[in-house]
Interface confidence: medium
């Protein structure tokens, strides 16, 4: 905050604006009768340099001329680009306690002359828009620089606009505010940009263009689509355009897609027929326009039209599977399962499924519709049965898919051989097998079926399955496969009228079980001990249990325990052991083993056999 220079003046030579690398002389002069009151000879003028309001240097040593008590001249060099403030102060040396008094100040600007503007580009948005040009100004000048945009054209058309750049704003675009009309389509126009500041001026090369070069049509608007006869695959796209448009580009894609379908349309007049759409699919449509077939620029893409195509009748074949369970001597329960069609096959919202069970010879037919993907019925055990299922949406139904109901595991000769299940990673299992050795009839297909081995899984959860062609002997199962869960996997070989199966258990990842089985009872029968237990709770098994181990040792003995290892069976919960001495008290416990290791021991039970040694 320098007071209006009452005490004196500061001047700069050659000028307060200098080119980068130049030196300047700053003179500070006191006005008559100003200065230190008693001893004019004690007047000392000092010059301080400030950058961004911060004192950076006292230029006491840069004095080149001193008229004692009245004026001093300082030389300043190596000034950086931009603005630097110099303040002259008076220091009365006889009064040490008083701070120097400001006399006057000056700002010196260091910069460069403007470079010729380059890369001029002009556009007019729409037939009714105005011409706006932009350019590259080149290096920053660090000075206030004025730019003038001049346009000249036919019929003595001239027009100019100005703007400036400084440290707060940049000028590299100007709107001339004039509209070029289509009747000037063949005319040539010239624009030039001139730049000027305190250190010099420069001018761009002239830039020549025509109406077609610079006019960018407005993007099409009011886009809509009309589906012919409510077709899901054919529709007419309609839109509004500027009058001079001769070429359109259309792009469209399903919403979940990553690549556009592109179409060029000449003289479309706001209308185009599309014939390859997918029914019941959310689409996005956009359109761009051009005023000339060969020259000119494309408009920006229009706003998106998003719409769903209408439904058409389903076309897919349902993947059907079933389970058979005998209820009593003359009745069986058939549970049919099928997989939902994928969207491209369903072609609409599936409203229901039509299910038919038919006894082939007696022509008995059971029919029903369901909204679920399974259906259960009790039917006689006699006769040859066939099932069919079709899917229906609002436009119609798919062709029914048929399957013969056979005894899935009834033919031992059709059982696949050497079935193995190997964990591939956290969420899939590789199942391999060998074909049946002595099949009477040809294998038409294999079905790999799997289900988590947890309580109630047969009733609560439908099976998962894969259809495998007869020449394949492996399947990678991944649907609904979770780590640390044991799955029962069945490989079915199906011929036209028979089925054979083999079963195996498998997991995608395993750990040692969390706990061991709980011994619930020890009973003695006919000189043998029967150990009974409850299985480990399902979440604690952590994979497929391979074995249970029963350990025993004499109470208070420090010897290593004996063990009996038995193959795990879900249905088994007791086992005999026969190598214990009578009238000796034993401690018994159990563990469980997965492929990853052995569980901690379960509860301990004491028992003293009474019978004679075996």
């Amino acid at each position: 905050n320098i007071d209006v220079c009452k005490l004196g003046t500061v001047t700069v030579q050659p000028a307060p604006v200098i080119p980068l690398g130049s030196a300047a002389n700053i003179s500070c002069s006191l006005n008559p009768k100003q200065g230190c009151s008693h001893y004019p000879s004690s007047n000392e003028l000092i010059l301080l340099k400030f950058v961004n309001d911060v004192l950076v240097e006292n230029l006491h040593g840069k004095k080149v001329h001193d008229h004692t008590g009245h004026s001093s001249t300082f030389q300043v060099t190596n000034l950086s680009l931009g603005m630097t403030l110099f303040v002259c102060k008076l220091n009365c040396s006889n009064s040490q306690k008083k701070p120097p008094v400001p006399v006057c100040g000056v700002e010196i600007s260091v910069g460069v002359a403007p470079e010729p503007p380059q890369n001029i580009s002009c556009v007019q948005e729409g037939e009714n828009g105005t011409v706006a040009c932009s350019w590259n100004s080149g290096k920053v000048t660090y000075l206030k620089t004025n730019y003038t945009l001049q346009l000249s054209g036919p019929n003595n058309l001239t027009c100019q606009k100005q703007c400036f750049s400084d440290n707060r704003q940049n000028c590299n675009r100007l709107d001339l505010g004039i509209n070029l009309s289509p009747d000037l389509a063949e005319s040539r126009f010239i624009v030039r940009v001139t730049a000027i500041n305190d250190l010099g001026n420069s001018s761009s090369l002239p830039h020549t263009f025509t109406f077609l070069d610079i006019v960018i049509p407005l993007p099409p608007w009011d886009i809509r689509i009309n589906f012919l006869n409510a077709s899901g695959s054919r529709g007419t796209l309609q839109w509004e355009d500027e009058g001079q448009v001769v070429l359109n580009q259309l792009r469209y894609q399903p919403l979940n897609s990553t690549s556009w379908n592109m179409v060029n349309a000449t003289n479309a007049k706001g209308k185009y027929d599309l014939r390859d759409l997918r029914p019941f699919t959310e689409y996005e449509f956009q359109i761009s326009s051009k005023l000339h077939l060969s020259g000119g620029s494309w408009s920006n893409w229009s706003e998106s039209l998003r719409t769903r195509t209408p439904e058409e009748e389903p076309v897919g074949i349902l993947d059907i599977w079933y389970m058979k369970q005998d209820i009593d001597y003359d009745r069986q329960q058939i549970s049919l399962f099928w997989k939902s069609l994928n969207p491209s096959e369903a072609r609409g919202k599936i409203l229901h499924y039509q299910v038919t069970l038919q006894e082939v010879t007696k022509k008995t037919t059971l029919q029903n519709t369901t909204r679920h993907t399974s259906w259960t019925r009790v039917i006689p055990r006699t006769g040859a049965w066939t099932a069919s299922v079709s899917a229906a949406n609002s436009k119609g139904a798919s062709a029914p898919t048929h399957i013969n109901i056979v005894d899935l595991c009834g033919t031992g000769l059709l059982a696949p051989h050497q079935v193995s299940a190997k964990s591939e990673n956290m969420d899939n299992i590789l199942v391999t097998w060998q074909p049946p050795k002595k099949a009477d009839s040809a294998v038409r297909e294999y079905i790999v079926e799997w289900r988590a081995l947890q309580p109630g899984s047969i009733t609560k959860f439908p099976p998962h399955w894969l259809r495998i062609p007869p020449d394949n002997m492996s399947a990678l199962i991944s649907e609904n496969i979770k780590p640390y869960i044991c799955y029962e996997i069945r490989v079915h070989a199906l011929s036209e009228s028979q089925g054979g199966c083999s079963s195996i258990r498998g997991d995608s990842k395993h750990k040692a079980p969390v706990s061991g089985p709980h011994i619930t009872a020890i009973t003695e029968k006919k000189e043998r001990l029967f150990i009974s237990w409850t299985h480990i709770p399902f979440p604690e098994q952590r994979g497929c249990i391979l074995h249970y181990r029963i350990y025993w040792k004499e109470r208070d003995s420090t010897a290593q325990p004996e063990l009996c290892e038995i193959q795990y069976r879900r249905s088994q919960n007791s086992h005999p052991i026969s190598s214990l001495q009578p009238r000796v008290t034993y401690v018994l416990w159990m563990t469980a083993v997965t492929a990853a290791g052995e569980s901690p021991q379960g509860n301990e039970r004491e028992f003293c056999p009474q019978g004679k040694a075996n």
């Epitope: 074995h547 009996c564 290892e565 038995i566 190598s579 083993v593 492929a595 290791g597």
Partner: nanobody
Framework: QVQLQESGGGSVQAGGSLRLSCAAS????????MGWFRQAPGKEREGVAT????????YYADSVKGRFTISQDNAKNTVYLQMNSLKPEDTAMYYC???????????????????WGQGTQVTVSS
């Protein structure tokens, strides 16, 4: 196809030591029971020691506890029987065995094992 090959047998004075090796091929899963059994002329085959290769659990017949040690080298698929303080009653044909089937298993019962080697003779003289 699992195959077992024993080696290391021979003649030794009482109080001496021998180390038997059993090289297994064709075993692809992580944990199996393997064991050493012996049969002296005119006697039944008896269990000497067994080991579960998955965890290193070991079991010994009372007659060899403290003198014999069963161990494994999983990298080489080999099971060893280190026999120290040998006695004349240890003289027998020594067999290596592996259990590669399911069913019930008892620690030192020969009928719990289904795959056998050819055997190696151990003779201890006084």
């Amino acid at each position: 196809q699992v195959q077992l090959q024993e080696s290391g047998g021979g003649s030794v004075q009482a109080g001496g030591s021998l180390r038997l090796s059993c090289a297994a091929s064709g075993i692809t899963y992580r944990g199996v029971w393997m064991g050493w059994f012996r049969q002296a002329p005119g006697k039944e085959r008896e269990g000497v020691a067994t080991i579960y290769t998955g965890s290193g659990h070991t079991y010994y017949a009372d007659s060899v506890k403290g003198r014999f040690t069963i161990s494994q080298d999983n990298a080489k698929n080999t099971v060893y029987l280190q026999m120290n303080s040998l006695k004349p009653e240890d003289t027998a044909m020594y067999y290596c065995a592996a259990r590669t089937v399911g069913g019930t298993f008892y620690t030192l019962a020969a009928d719990s094992f289904n795959t056998w080697g050819q055997g190696t003779q151990v003779t201890v003289s006084s």
